[in-house]
């Protein structure tokens, strides 16, 4: 190797200056004894290199690029060799930003997968490899005092969410949770959440079905539907409230919301609908009165209201 580049920093803030030095060894005898070292950033020649011979006979060229405005570029030093440019050495330069503070950190406890899933917004593009780590600890109080640390949760590349498995969770106890973002230019941390996993529980929705008509029960009136639902069994003992939504299958009507319904109702007569009309219905539930997240809406149930009964005119005889 005849030449070697060293740089003040291979990774800098976008727009910052960078200084580089290229040294050509004396024993490169096939070279011109007074070679002119040239600099190139990407495909563009860069003027402004200051060249000198050092006491040991090596040649050095120093260049300062006042603003590195490329997020990634190769800086090379070269010599004119005949009619071509002979590259002696090159380095990759990176420029970007330190990570912004991750924001909008939120978590939900998924009882179906027995894990606490947290997500966040990473902030603006840094143009640099940036790692995110979900960090947490157990706390007996309100997270002012740190208990046992929980194993870091590292999301897959490019993802802004991570799942803490049940074995690292303590239900009905607070956890301190935050996201740390790190790249070559710095580290930032989100504000800390302090939460009991059960207070961010997200239940699975009940299964909505039509109520089996019983022989002794009156059939539904026109414009009414008799519904029942089967709670998600693993969440049966969690007090919940639920809500229904419905809309006619045809037309552009928006959803109409009915609720809150106690989960315990398990059955409901929905009236005030159009007779002889097909409806789409869904139900969802939330832990209540304790905190929680709404479940997703249940799979749709499609039902048709009965025809309007024929009107009979009754003649009342007064005696």
């Amino acid at each position: 190797e005849c030449g070697h580049i060293s740089v003040s920093a291979p990774i800098v803030h976008l727009g910052d200056p960078i200084t580089a030095s290229c040294i050509i060894k004396q024993n490169c005898s096939h070279l011109d004894p007074e070679p002119q070292i040239l600099w190139r950033l990407g495909a563009e020649l860069q003027p402004g290199g200051r060249q000198q011979r050092l006491s040991d006979g090596t040649q050095e060229s120093i260049i300062t690029l006042p603003h590195l405005n490329h997020t990634q570029a190769f800086l090379s030093c070269a010599l004119n060799w005949g009619n071509s440019l002979q590259i002696l050495d090159q380095v990759e330069l990176r420029a970007g930003y330190p990570p912004a503070i991750p924001h909008n950190l939120s978590c939900l406890m998924n009882l179906a997968t027995s894990s606490l899933i947290c997500q966040w917004e990473p902030g603006p593009e840094t143009h640099l490899p940036t790692s995110f780590t979900l960090k947490s600890f157990k706390s007996r109080g309100n997270c002012q005092t740190q208990g046992d640390s929980i194993l870091d949760c590292v999301p897959k590349d490019g993802q802004s969410h991570c799942s803490i498995p049940r074995k690292h969770l303590l239900l009905y106890q607070n956890m301190g949770i935050w996201v740390q973002a790190e790249n070559a230019l710095g580290t930032s941390m989100s504000p800390q959440l302090c939460l009991d996993p059960m207070d961010v529980v997200k239940l699975e929705p009940p299964m909505l079905r039509t109520m089996d008509p019983s022989p002794e029960a009156a059939p539904p009136q026109a414009g009414c539907l008799q519904l029942s639902w089967e709670p998600w069994q693993p969440g049966l003992h969690i007090n919940q409230k639920c809500e229904l939504r419905h809309k006619p299958q045809r037309g552009e009507a928006s959803w109409a919301l009915v609720g809150p319904l106690p989960l315990e109702a398990l059955q409901y007569e929905l009236c005030g609908l159009l007779p002889a009309t097909a409806y789409t219905l869904q139900i969802r539930c939330i832990r209540w009165p304790l905190p929680g997240h709404w479940s997703d809406w249940s799979p749709s149930l499609e039902l048709r209201t009965t025809e309007r009964a024929p009107t009979h005119h009754h003649h009342h005889h007064h005696h």
Epitope: L111, A112, T113, S114, R166, K167, L171, M198, P231, Q233, P234, L236, H237, I238, N239, P262, E264, A265, L266, P289
Partner: antibody, heavy 118, light 107 residues
Framework: EVQLLESGGGLVQPGGSLRLSCAAS????????MGWVRQAPGKGLEWVSS????????PYADSVKGRFTISRDNSKNTLYLQMNSLRAEDTAVYYC???????????WGQGTLVTVSS | DIQMTQSPSSLSASVGDRVTITCRAS??????LNWYQQKPGKAPKLLIY???NLQNGVPSRFSGSGSGTDFTLTISSLQPEDFATYYC?????????FGGGTKVEIK
Amino acid sequence: EVQLLESGGGLVQPGGSLRLSCAASGFTFSLYWMGWVRQAPGKGLEWVSSISSSGGVTPYADSVKGRFTISRDNSKNTLYLQMNSLRAEDTAVYYCAKLGELGWFDPWGQGTLVTVSS
Amino acid sequence: DIQMTQSPSSLSASVGDRVTITCRASQGISSYLNWYQQKPGKAPKLLIYYASNLQNGVPSRFSGSGSGTDFTLTISSLQPEDFATYYCQQSYSTPLTFGGGTKVEIK
């Protein structure tokens, strides 16, 4: 401190009836599911029935369905188990217990013995 | 119905021993598995809920692990007061069901 105190156990003839009570204190009774678990002499634990916080949902074990009725009076902080058509195999210590949100029993009462024998 | 099978049904151990009791569900129950300790003439006492959460006031020598169908209760160093019968219970669906119990006796 959460306390559960069962009463109403005793000796009853096959086919007879008995009503167990469980008085609760130390917690907001109306917010919790409650349940009955029994244990025959020298045997393991068997769930009998549970009741939701306001009494609308009442699952039962197949072995007692149609014969036993669970109920509660939230104004009196009391849980009940009405046992009809009793059989010899219903002989057991009956425990009342508060249910946790994910279905565990804690705490338990001290138990009341029901003996069905002629 | 979900059947719960506990093993062994009894074991003899000495103070200081590490003791492991297993519980197997006849179908997957996620983490809905609870462990109880019962001493003669007394009501059961909750030790572990939701497979691995230690109930308040229970010594840290007790621990629970597992998910799906296979679960374990471990006592890291058996103490004299730990000689009792231990039960597992699934709370994934009704009917709620218990294992047959494991009696831990003094060797």
